[in-house]
Interface confidence: low
């Protein structure tokens, strides 16, 4: 799925109000600096792009992320606010539903959580020029292009 | 633990310009913006301006637009104001702060120590 | 800019009594900051978001509101409480208000 078409402010609205409370819910008892962050974004789209994929596909150790609360509300986000997601997620979401058995939070879980944290972080905030100052200057931003 | 160490006491005389330096420690540099906010002596808190150590993009107060500059190495994670063409009513303390963008409108969440300007002929 | 103006500027109270401290926007903005500082110290987060409290802040603090009215709130002084208060917004650029004095009357 091509997420540039999202509405980007509505999803962080998304994430500021629940998301973020949610995935922070889910890492409690965790120290922040228990894990390093190994997965990174360069702009919204991939953000987006690395994020559903940290949260719903199934992973080595962690196969147990997509009932949870921040997932459900990540699905609902990208649902409304990307034009023609749900359509691609039909199929997904019935092999997820056959995949799943127990909910188990193993430690791998908590390091992809961790990792998801900090894409949503990248994605909330990913430069300063997000903020529309007039007096925007960037030295070194060749590569990271922002869709609104 | 996240620290930010400032350099030591300047002073400087009117016309001068003035370079102060703010070292990260204890998290990721480039993950957050780093404001630059000043207080003159018995005054409220004043925004300079802020940059994103992960771009190098910057904003500034129009207050000092064309006066300062702010910088960042990220090899160091050390973070820099040069304020130019000094006057008397730049004395005052200024601090580095770190901005962190978990919560919802960037709060500013540790902050430097202080670096005292004195500017005097 | 948007301009934060903070009333009372000095607030005289004793140990003990509630604190309401008010932060009004010259325009609507989304969520304040409030921030604690002592003579000769950096300013330390209060509360973020305009109700969220920092780390290690006791819960006798509190903030609230929305728009262009806001209020932090000391539900009962203690010692350590007599500092200036100063609230800062995000919406555009930044912006820290005069600040209000909460001394010992």
């Known amino acids: 799925y091509d997420f540039t078409n999202c509405d980007f402010e509505k999803i962080k609205a998304a994430y500021l109000s629940t998301i973020s409370k949610d995935l922070i819910t889910y890492m409690s008892g965790t120290k922040s600096t228990e894990f390093n962050n190994t997965v990174s974004c360069s702009n919204r789209p991939h953000c987006l792009t690395e994020i559903q994929s940290l949260t719903f596909n199934p992973t080595a150790g962690c196969a147990s992320l997509a009932k949870e609360m921040f997932a459900m509300k990540t699905k609902a986000a990208l649902a409304i606010w990307c034009p023609g997601y749900s359509e691609t997620q039909i199929n997904a979401t019935q092999a997820m539903k056959k995949a799943r058995k127990s909910k188990v939070t193993t430690n791998k879980c908590l390091e992809q959580v961790s990792q998801l944290q900090g894409l949503w972080r990248r994605f909330n905030r990913p430069l300063l020029k997000q903020q529309g100052s007039s007096d925007y200057k960037d030295d070194d931003d060749k590569h990271h292009h922002h869709h609104h | 633990e996240v620290q930010l160490v400032q350099s030591g006491a300047e002073v400087k005389k009117p016309g001068a310009s003035v370079k102060v330096s703010c070292k990260a420690s204890?998290?990721?540099?480039?993950?957050?913006?780093m404001n630059w906010v000043r207080q003159a002596p018995g005054q409220r808190l004043e925004w300079m301006g802020i940059?994103?150590?992960?771009?190098?993009?910057?904003s500034y107060n129009q207050k000092f637009k064309g006066r300062v500059t702010i910088t960042r190495d990220t090899s160091a994670s050390t973070a820099y104001m040069e304020l130019s063409s000094l006057r008397s009513e730049d004395t005052a303390v200024y601090y580095c702060?770190?901005?962190?963008?978990?919560?919802?409108?960037?709060?500013?969440?540790?902050w430097g120590q202080g670096t005292t300007v004195t500017v005097s002929s | 800019e948007i301009v934060l103006t903070q009333s009372p500027a000095t607030l005289s109270l004793s140990p003990g009594e509630r604190a309401t401290l008010s932060c009004r926007a010259s325009s609507s903005v989304s969520y304040m900051h409030w921030y604690q500082q002592k003579p000769g110290q950096a300013p330390r987060p209060l509360i973020y978001?305009?109700?969220n409290l920092a780390s290690g802040i006791p819960a006798r603090f509190s903030g609230s509101g929305s728009g262009t009215d806001y209020t932090l709130t000391i539900s009962r002084l203690e010692p350590e409480d007599f500092a200036v208060y100063y609230c800062?917004?995000?919406?555009?650029?930044?912006?820290f208000g005069g600040g209000t004095k909460v001394e010992i009357k």
């Open positions: 702060a770190r901005e962190d963008y978990d919560y919802d409108g960037y709060a500013m969440d540790h």
């Open positions: 978001a305009t109700s």
């Open positions: 800062q917004q995000w919406s555009s650029n930044r912006t």
């Open positions: 940059i994103s150590p992960y771009n190098g993009g910057t």
């Open positions: 204890g998290y990721t540099f480039t993950d957050d913006y």
